[in-house]
């Protein structure tokens, strides 16, 4: 058995359903995406040995599903998947990878072929600990590369300052596949949001630990860099589920006046 979870039940139906639903979010210029053709291109990787799937095996899938990302709307992240999805609000505020078509169809799903058979493996799938060239990791590598290449304007990045190993994983999708593929001539600046979990530890903030490494790397690459601790719009969203926690107390005079009233 592999270390990862098996192929998601009803993979094809979920994929095609998400694709059809997403088409309505696309601009008139791009809404004629052929979901069946996109699925067939994705399925190519499901016909291969689960440890022999390369990022390039998803090239046709990406070419068929790729669409434009509005300027200033890209939102990269590490260790904050659910928060990013909630904040992006189905492309309304931002368009993270999970909110572009090629990311949406696979978000939170798992897939692989059986090791010595042609069927899908619903029991387990390989992770990077089992083998590097597994179907899921290779998919997200290829998708991340494309997402970076197609991002423009102000680039936003949400990192988790409560993550025990640090806010910026030195080895991660953002570090290894996204930063190297940012197109410098299309980018005005990079804005980092270091978010801390409500009531969670403050492991790192802007300018500390791994964040210093990230800042140096981006500046060395010639990017204009800024960093915000607990970006307020996101913090307010976090506080929806922790309204009585001290971290969520409204501190402004106006808010105090409203409470008295």
């Amino acid at each position: 058995r592999w270390r990862g979870e098996g192929t998601s039940a009803h993979l094809r139906d979920i994929f095609l359903g998400r694709c059809a639903e997403y088409r309505a979010l696309l601009s008139p210029e791009q809404r004629n995406k052929n979901c069946t053709a996109i699925w067939e291109a994705f399925k190519v990787a499901l016909d291969k040995d689960p440890c022999s799937v390369l990022p390039s095996d998803y090239d046709l899938f990406i070419n068929l599903s790729r669409h434009s990302i509005p300027r200033d709307k890209s939102l990269f992240w590490e260790n904050s998947h659910l928060l990013v999805n909630s904040f992006a609000d189905n492309t309304r505020r931002f368009m993270p990878l999970s909110d572009v078509l090629y990311g949406r169809v696979a978000d939170f799903l798992s897939w692989c072929r059986q090791k010595n058979d042609s069927g899908l493996d619903y029991q387990s799938c390989p992770t990077s600990e089992d083998c590097e060239n597994n179907p899921v990791d290779s998919f997200w590598k290829r998708a991340s590369i494309q997402y970076s290449k197609d991002s423009s304007g102000v680039i936003h990045v949400m990192l988790n300052g409560s993550e025990p190993t640090g806010a910026y994983p030195i080895k991660g999708f953002f570090a290894d596949y996204e930063i190297p593929n940012l197109q410098k001539e299309k980018i005005t600046r990079i804005e980092i949001w270091v978010m801390h979990e409500i009531g969670g530890p403050n492991v790192e903030s802007c300018g500390e630990g791994s964040m210093k490494v990230l800042e140096k790397r981006l500046k060395d690459m010639g990017f204009q860099y800024s960093c915000i601790n607990d970006y307020r719009p996101v913090k307010l969203l976090q506080c929806v589920d922790h309204s009585t926690h001290p971290d969520c107390a409204l501190k402004s005079a106006a808010a105090a006046t409203q409470r008295k009233a």
């Epitope: 601009s27 008139p28 210029e29 004629n32 434009s68 509005p70 200033d72 197609d150």
Partner: antibody, heavy 115, light 107 residues
């Protein structure tokens, strides 16, 4: 209010190139595609192609591929359409229009190709 | 690419007449069809999109119907300012294409 203002009329020789500009105002330029549509004298509307707001994608009509180039300069909210290797049957009024629905149009630019 | 055909290519009508123009697509375009009005020397004006949604400031005498491959533009009571050429256009992804046009002139 949304406005698209195009450059003035051009007269060109066959084989030359023409570059038409389209300056946008009244909306966030990078949020919308810009389309180019032409109309030969007494003829119908012909879609030539479009360029997306982030300057990542362009999509050209098969008829014009290899001859047309669409670009945009977000800093001055201006889109450009360049048509090369002009022929006499390229004589037309060239319009830019804001996508995705073509609700707002420029006033048109007459390009005359004549020897 | 999707080919749009319009009929009739021209028609003569009088003020107050009910006028119907049809547009047929070579493949399914769902409800993604728009109609434009163009007067001589002017840029086209968006009348209807998504088959039946009226554009900004378009009078209610204009209406659209259909889905899939067959669509209709109806002017319930033709007014003097409605004499013009009408084009259908699909907005189901690029390449966008236009129909050849229908000229409505005075009988």
């Amino acid at each position: 209010q949304v406005q698209l203002v195009q450059s003035g009329a051009e007269v060109k020789k066959p084989g030359a190139s023409v570059k038409v500009s389209c300056k946008a105002s009244g909306y966030t330029f990078s949020d919308y595609w810009v389309h180019w549509v032409r109309q030969a004298p007494g003829q119908g509307l012909e879609w030539m192609g479009a360029i997306d707001g982030s300057d990542t994608f362009n999509d050209y009509s098969q008829k014009f591929k290899g001859r047309v180039t669409m670009t945009r300069d977000t800093s001055i909210s201006t889109a450009y359409m360049e048509l090369s290797r002009l022929r006499s049957d390229d004589t037309a009024v060239y319009y830019c229009a804001r996508g995705g629905l073509l609700q707002y149009w420029g006033q048109g630019t007459l390009v005359t190709v004549s020897s | 690419e999707i080919v749009l055909t319009q009929s009739p290519s021209s028609l003569s009508a009088s003020v107050g007449d009910r006028v119907t123009i049809t547009c047929r697509a070579s493949e399914n375009i769902y409800s993604y069809l728009a109609w434009y009005q163009q007067k001589p020397g002017k840029a086209p004006k968006l009348l209807i999109y998504n088959t039946k949604t009226l554009g900004e400031g378009v009078p209610s005498r204009f209406s659209g119907s259909g889905s899939g491959t067959d669509f209709t533009l109806t002017i319930s009571s033709l007014q003097p300012e409605d004499f013009a050429t009408y084009y259908c256009q699909h907005h189901y992804g690029t390449p966008f294409t236009f129909g050849p046009g229908t000229k409505v002139d005075i009988k």
